[in-house]
């Protein structure tokens, strides 16, 4: 295979039919077959090549590794463990590689891994110890700062007999390894709820993306500990109203920007506090775009233009007067 070029342009390694047995480890500047490498940019791209496993002969200089659009299926323990270790690898993108299983310790021996993208993989089996690497109650801290897990929900028929939300949260919380995580993206995962303990145990979060899920309520979610939170994306969920406790917590976060577009807000008497808050707060971005979805008579009304007289609740009829 070709050595890498000294310029920042990429050199590629064509597939070869030599013996698959490597009598000695690869030279440090080799480029794996089916990949493109730039030593100057410290980058290796093995993209859309239908790879079924992580190349064994990754160059030691790699800082940015793209393994997108492949057919990896399973990421085993130590999938990136090498001798010498890939000590410089900081950004790893595995999106769209048909991963359905990530095993415990898959990312061990990557001491500099700051950014990991597993998006667009149908993760039916994400080990609780995928990111912590250990089943200890308190693991060594992960170096991860940014974890991108958008659209990792598998098709309904491929899910395990357990809560998908619970599986993901277990991996996020195991061993308290992700205490340093600053960006977490969980968009497009059909989340119905957010387990109440997840945010409390990720105190360093700056950016949290929960957009395009199916969240109905934030009643049991506490944002109080997230004092560093700068952006909270809740667009395209199923939120009906934000209650006082949530409003107060969000208002108390010093740097926060909240995104609430495209939720089916229910503009009845329970919405009064939220409307009052919206009129006063600066934390909601694009608040003038928020509109009612229900009841029918309120559809498309702008929340900021409502007053208390608009927000009424139909009286609850006695059971004898209710119709089916």
């Amino acid at each position: 295979s070709s050595p890498t070029s000294s310029a920042s342009s990429f050199s590629s390694s064509a597939p070869f039919l030599a013996s698959a047995v490597s009598a000695q480890p690869p030279l440090p500047d080799q480029c794996p077959a089916l990949c493109e490498c730039s030593e100057a940019a410290r980058t290796v791209k093995c993209v859309n090549r239908n790879l079924t496993e992580v190349p064994t002969d990754l160059p030691a200089y790699v800082r940015n590794l793209f393994l997108t659009g492949n057919q990896l299926a399973v990421l085993p323990a130590g999938a990136f463990a090498r001798r010498p270790p890939l000590a410089e690898l900081a950004a790893l993108n595995l999106s769209g590689s048909r991963l359905d299983e990530v095993r415990a310790g898959a990312f061990e021996h990557l001491p500099s891994l700051r950014q990991l993208d597993l998006s667009h993989n149908p993760l039916a089996d994400l080990s609780p110890f995928a990111f912590s690497g250990s089943n200890a109650s308190v693991s060594a801290p992960s170096p991860l700062v940014e974890l991108i897990l958008n659209h990792i929900v598998p098709p309904e028929d491929e899910r395990q007999n357990r809560s998908f939300e619970g599986m993901v949260v277990a991996a996020l919380l195991a061993g308290r390894a992700l205490q340093g995580l600053r960006r977490l993206e969980l968009a497009s995962n059909h989340f119905l709820y957010l387990p109440r303990d997840v945010l409390a145990q990720l105190p360093s979060l700056r950016h949290l993306d929960l957009s395009n899920n199916s969240l109905v309520s934030l009643t049991y979610v506490s944002f109080r500990n997230l004092t560093h939170l700068e952006s909270l994306h809740l667009e395209d969920n199923a939120l009906k109203v934000l209650h006082n406790g949530t409003l107060a917590e969000l208002q108390g976060l010093p740097h926060i920007r909240v995104f609430l577009d495209n939720n089916p807000w229910v503009c009845d008497c329970h919405m009064a506090d939220m409307v009052t808050w919206l009129k006063e707060t600066e934390v909601v971005q694009g608040k003038d775009r928020l509109t009612c979805a229900y009841p029918e008579k309120m559809r498309n009304r702008v929340l900021l233009e409502l007053n208390s007289a608009d927000l009424d609740c139909d009286p609850i009829l006695p059971p004898s007067l209710q119709t089916s």
Epitope: S22, R83, P85, H109
Partner: antibody, heavy 121, light 111 residues
Framework: EVQLLESGGGLVQPGGSLRLSCAAS????????MTWVRQAPGKGLEWVSE????????NYTPSLKDRFTISRDNAKNTLYLQMNSLRAEDTAVYYC??????????????WGQGTTVTVSS | DIVLTQSPASLAVSLGQRATISCRPS??????????IHWYQQKPGQPPKLLIK???NLESGVPARFSGSGSGTDFTLTISPVEAEDTATYYC?????????FGGGTKLEIK
Amino acid sequence: EVQLLESGGGLVQPGGSLRLSCAASGFDFSRYWMTWVRQAPGKGLEWVSEINPDSRTINYTPSLKDRFTISRDNAKNTLYLQMNSLRAEDTAVYYCARPDHDYNPYYFNYWGQGTTVTVSS
Amino acid sequence: DIVLTQSPASLAVSLGQRATISCRPSQSVSTSSNSYIHWYQQKPGQPPKLLIKYASNLESGVPARFSGSGSGTDFTLTISPVEAEDTATYYCQQSWEIPLTFGGGTKLEIK
């Protein structure tokens, strides 16, 4: 219980050949890298060779790679070391060893009892 | 190849006292999170037994009187307090790169 049992050692003349075997039991042999380590009489440990689960990656200590060949048969749960052109300095106890995880070995916590190879005329 | 220099070659320590063994790799074998040095104990006629992995992590079932420390190019195995059954030869091993290499060994005798 993990068990590794070496065999095939013995007395051989210089220039001769031997094939060592290591029969594995008590674990899924096909998942693990396997390694040979040797120890000359009264001397220290020397890493010889390793092989990954599907035999696609093989490494040797540089001074031995031209004469020694590691292989495995996952169907038989057996690891092999073919030794050719043997020399007096190859006289040693040969151990097979296994790491505790199923990726590149960093250390070894399962060892066989060893088989003795003596190269002498 | 990475050369591991172990010292002393032999050591006699009184029962209950502390034994300290040094291992110095010819180049750094540490990242920010791991040191790729491991320690073994070998008694006559037996295979080696793993004591410590990654410089300081005690292997399951190994008594707590064994401990490891160090990083970069300077590592230490400490046994305290020494017991009679600790009479053995101790080896360090690096797994930073291929070929894996062992130190020359330190023979510990209990007085």
